[in-house]
């Protein structure tokens, strides 16, 4: 096992240079020190080491820093960032936007979405603020990444990001995530009016509380039944017939086609029959 072998005399390097290319894998494992690599990451990136050799270097760094890399090293990772996993990144403590931006440049076009998300999340967790460059770098990543952030991290996402979210980006988000994102979206779109507001907020409605839905009913949104079906059952069942009538507007008749399915069935079950009768749709509670 390579782990057991001792470094041959005279083979212990003082610097990272081309000679290391010719070391056998077990020699790299036995002779190269993690702190040496950490201090000379620029050379590690410059010299054309094989993927296997770089993997050994990563193993050495991981052993040297079992609690996660220090920010001084993270800042210097350069292209070596590609060999770092999201799990590794979650152990880091990144506080500088420069560090984040440096690594985001490295990751550009490299299919490293998971690493980028983990990096931004760890930066946010440390209380970092998203500057324009970071937000721009996130532009290229499908916004489903929002569901990967912890609820705490989500709070740190600027509301401006909400403008970029598409219809199915949040399909995998938990209820808690959606609740936070709905509030962010409300704040992002507060100066948008009428139909445009509803088009924007529609994506986030799975996070709307009962109170939010009641408030939404005050704005002539004419919600279609497909959107209605995505609402939280808990939020929906407490709405009155009048509120649902106002929410759906001209689409109120579509309740009939969905009356046997959740969440419409759950909502009907909670209403008084005389109130349902007032809709004239033949709905049964």
């Amino acid at each position: 096992d390579t782990e057991q072998k001792a470094c041959p005399p005279g083979k212990e390097p003082n610097v990272v240079d081309e000679n290391l290319i010719f070391y056998q894998n077990w020699e790299l494992e036995a002779c190269v020190d993690g702190t040496l690599l950490a201090g000379q990451m620029d050379l590690v990136n410059e010299i054309p080491f094989t993927y296997e050799q770089l993997s050994i270097f990563k193993h050495k760094l991981d052993k040297t820093y079992p609690q996660g890399y220090p920010e001084s090293l993270i800042k210097q990772l350069g292209h070596f960032f590609r060999y770092v996993s999201p799990e590794d990144i979650r152990q880091w403590n990144v506080t500088s936007p420069d560090t984040v931006n440096t690594l985001l440049k490295v990751s550009k076009g490299q299919k490293m979405d998971a690493q980028v998300i983990a990096l931004v999340a760890c930066y946010l967790r440390g209380g970092g603020k998203l500057d324009e460059d970071i937000v721009k770098a996130l532009d290229n990543i499908p916004l489903s990444y929002l569901c990967d952030f912890s609820p705490q991290d989500l709070h740190a996402i600027p509301s401006s990001v909400m403008w970029l979210v598409g219809l199915h980006d949040l399909d995998k988000c938990s209820q808690r995530h959606l609740g936070i994102l709905y509030q962010k979206a409300c704040s992002a779109f507060q100066n948008v009016s009428g139909l445009e507001y509803f088009e924007k907020i529609r994506t986030f409605l799975g996070g709307a509380s009962r109170e939010d839905l009641r408030a939404l009913s005050q704005h002539n949104v004419s919600m279609d039944i497909a959107t209605f079906k995505k609402l939280q059952v808990d939020a929906l069942v407490g709405l009155s017939v009048a509120e649902v009538q106002k929410l759906l507007g001209p689409h109120i008749g579509d309740l009939k086609t969905e009356e046997d399915k959740s969440p419409v069935r759950d909502w009907l079950f909670r209403q008084q029959q005389k109130d349902l009768d007032s809709l004239g749709l033949g709905l049964q509670g």
Epitope: E211, R214, A215, S217, Q218, A242, E243, V244
Partner: antibody, heavy 117, light 107 residues
Framework: EVQLVESGGGLVQPGGSLRLSCAAS????????MSWVRQAPGKGLEWVAT????????YYPDSVKGRFTISRDNSKNTLYLQMNSLRAEDTAVYYC??????????WGQGTLVTVSS | DIQMTQSPSSLSASVGDRVTITCRAS??????LNWYQQKPGKAPKLLIY???RLHSGVPSRFSGSGSGTDFTLTISSLQPEDFATYYC?????????FGQGTKVEIK
């Protein structure tokens, strides 16, 4: 039985302030939006303010925006209307009303506010 | 804001008469039209909501119709307790607005 009882009306000078209260009973107060509607002497009805069931959202017409503040205390089943910078044209009977979607379905008996020097 | 115009402003009628009050909205309000009854010195009471639905406890002699901008409240056979002022209110668009009222008096 739904009951709404307003209080706090009275005579106030122009520019002055007044706080109206409305005690609610007979329904789950925290489940409903609530509103204030006023009626000047011998005139029609005018909607003044609405607040969401949890107090997060508030709505006002332009005539009172920035001067009146609607609030609620769900633990006390009470609705409030804080009226500042009062004008002669704010003289009216102020009614507290339960609001359901687009309907003022139950009303209190009203409290008279007179703004005069 | 949506203007609500009621006509007539007042009318005189006898017990047993059929009474019709109209309400016109300055723009389409779909069916979000409610009617209230108010007696002197009392609070308004909801009679009809969503154009034609009777609120609980309201007698069936009251009925409502219309859609869009033109609405009607009909009392099929006027009773002594129906002498009051009637208001329409649109619930389609904020700010919610009321008509100026129609006073139904004894002839």
């Amino acid at each position: 039985e739904v009951q709404l009882v307003e209080s706090g009306g009275g005579l106030v000078q122009p520019g002055g302030s007044l706080r109206l209260s409305c005690a609610a009973s007979g329904f789950t107060f925290s489940d409903y939006f609530m509103s204030w509607v006023r009626q000047a002497p011998g005139k029609g009805l005018e909607w003044v303010a609405t607040i969401s069931n949890g107090g997060t959202y508030t709505y006002y017409p332009d005539s009172v925006k920035g001067r009146f503040t609607i609030s609620r205390d769900n633990s006390k089943n009470t609705l409030y209307l804080q009226m500042n910078s009062l004008r002669a044209e704010d003289t009216a009977v102020y009614y507290c009303a339960r609001f359901d979607g687009y309907i003022f379905d139950y009303w209190g008996q009203g409290t008279l506010v007179t703004v005069s020097s | 804001d949506i203007q609500m115009t009621q006509s007539p402003s007042s009318l005189s009628a006898s017990v047993g008469d059929r009474v019709t009050i109209t309400c016109r909205a300055s723009q389409d309000i779909s069916n979000y039209l409610n009617w209230y009854q108010q007696k002197p010195g009392k609070a308004p009471k909801l009679l009809i909501y969503y154009t034609s639905r009777l609120h609980s406890g309201v007698p069936s002699r009251f009925s409502g119709s219309g859609s869009g901008t033109d609405f009607t409240l009909t009392i099929s056979s006027l009773q002594p307790e129906d002498f009051a002022t009637y208001y329409c209110q649109q619930g389609n668009t904020l700010p919610y607005t009321f008509g100026q009222g129609t006073k139904v008096e004894i002839k």
